[in-house]
């Protein structure tokens, strides 16, 4: 236990990147019943880790907020230059105001156009969404069942005729190997037959007779 508390006192090490496991590993968890493993971490250590995670999350949020503030500042500084008034008089300032007003009007016009486009798009999206709902109502969805399917069958389904060609190609590639393995298969097959013969009623009969 002392071990655990001394860990918390030390700098928290960055967690290693999670190992990418194959989905088949997780399928096993889903299908097979398994005993719940007993946690090796104590409740106090768990609390410490939770607190630490919350602290990190808080810092991350603060950093993001700061980044957003900085981004806003940068965006404004590019759009709104600092006023350079040195050497400019009443006439220029008057003209500058006129220029800036004209710029504001132009931006307002653009904003109005963009808003109109956005409103139009929103309306279109709403209409299309409604159509989707209407169509959904007309057709009853079949309940989908999980189907076991081989890679070749999947290829065939997805690619159609093209998949057939690729499968043929694969067949050609495998032909050489097949000749070598056929013998083994035959032997294995014979051995299986013997086992089957003995394991059934026939086998028992033969044993009894002998």
């Amino acid at each position: 236990m002392a071990d655990g508390s001394s860990d918390a006192a030390r700098e928290p090490r960055p967690a290693p990147a999670p190992i990418r496991r194959r989905s088949s590993n997780y399928r096993a968890y889903a299908t097979e019943p398994h005993a719940k493993k007993k946690s090796k971490i104590s409740a106090s250590r768990k609390l410490q880790l939770k607190t630490l995670l919350l602290q990190i999350a808080k810092q991350e949020l603060e950093r993001e907020a700061e980044e957003r503030r900085g981004e806003k500042g940068r965006a404004l500084s590019t759009r709104c230059q600092p006023l350079e008034l040195a050497g400019l008089g009443f006439a220029e300032l008057q003209d500058l105001c006129r220029q800036l007003h004209a710029r504001v009007d132009k931006v307002d016009e653009e904003r109005y156009d963009i808003e109109a486009k956005v409103t139009k798009n929103i309306t279109e999206i709403a209409d299309l969404t409604q159509k989707i709902f209407d169509l959904r109502g007309k057709f009853k969805r079949p309940t989908l069942r999980r189907v076991r399917i081989s890679a070749d069958a999947m290829m065939q389904a997805l690619l159609g005729a093209r998949a057939k060609e690729s499968l043929d190609l694969r067949a050609h590639l495998k032909q050489v190997k097949k000749e070598d393995t056929e013998k083994e298969n035959r032997e294995v097959g014979d051995w299986r037959k013997n086992i089957d013969a003995l394991s059934g009623m026939e086998g028992r009969k033969k044993k009894f007779e002998s």
Epitope: E84, A86, G87, G89, F90, E92, Q94
Partner: antibody, heavy 121, light 107 residues
Framework: EVQMVESGGGLLKPGGSLKLSCAAS????????MSWVRQTPEKRLEWVAT????????FYPDSVKGRFTISRDNAKNTLYLQMLSLRSEDTAMYYC??????????????WGQGSSVTVSS | DIQMTQTSSSLSASLGDRVTISCRAS??????LNWYQQKPDGTIKLLIY???RLHSGVSSRFSGSGSGTDYSLTISNLEQEDIATYFC????????TFDTGTKLELK
């Protein structure tokens, strides 16, 4: 000593283009707005353009708007005037001047010696 | 645009004279008026800004006055070096405009 030296003038045909330069010295160039003023052969003075200290804002009379562009390079202490689609009425001596202001009143407190531009067919 | 006009395009005076050059604006320019001197060699200098403020290095013999649309430049004791052309310029509205100038000559 505040000094402005214009260069780049010349003789050219109507529709031609030219870029004038003005090298400034003796003051903190980036702190001042600058102007171009021309003097016609009839000795009339005409304001041509003004640029703010940082170069963000520029001002022109309608007679040159869209044809002339004032710009500056604060690192090089140089003022420029790009002139396009030149006309015979643009023939003049072009002066570069420093701007200053006092309670909203702006004025050209130091002038260069001028650079001659002649537009003729 | 604001038009600037001078009462006379040329003026003759003797050394030591008190000379007044007038300038009129087509509308009120709220004292935003400047005076420039152009020597025969083409050199241009600022003399007075904001109607009556004397630019640094300019002789106190020069003074300016006026308001609204009417303004004037006065040279109290004419000297040889003052022989030049004088321009007024309004700084109230863009475009900035100058008058045609008054050429000062010796009698």
């Amino acid at each position: 000593e505040v000094q402005m030296v214009e260069s780049g003038g010349g003789l050219l045909k109507p529709g031609g283009s030219l870029k004038l330069s003005c090298a400034a010295s003796g003051f903190t160039y980036s702190n001042y707005a600058m102007s171009w003023v021309r003097q016609t052969p009839e000795k009339r003075l005409e304001w041509v353009a003004t640029i703010s200290s940082g170069g963000s804002y520029s001002f022109y009379p309608d007679s040159v708007k869209g044809r002339f562009t004032i710009s500056r390079d604060n690192a090089k202490n140089t003022l420029y005037l790009q002139m396009l689609s030149l006309r015979s009425e643009d023939t003049a001596m072009y002066y570069c001047a420093r701007r200053d202001n006092y309670y909203g009143s702006s004025f050209m407190d130091y002038w260069g010696q001028g650079s001659s531009v002649t537009v003729s067919s | 645009d604001i038009q600037m006009t001078q009462t006379s395009s040329s003026l003759s005076a003797s050394l030591g004279d008190r000379v007044t050059i007038s300038c009129r604006a087509s509308q009120d320019i709220t004292n935003y008026l400047n005076w420039y001197q152009q020597k025969p060699d083409g050199t241009i200098k600022l003399l007075i800004y904001y109607t009556s403020r004397l630019h640094s290095g300019v002789s106190s013999r020069f003074s300016g006055s006026g308001s609204g649309t009417d303004y004037s430049l006065t040279i109290s004791n004419l000297e040889q070096e003052d022989i030049a052309t004088y321009f007024c310029q309004q700084g109230n509205t863009i475009p900035l405009t100058f008058d045609t100038g008054t050429k000062l000559e010796l009698k």
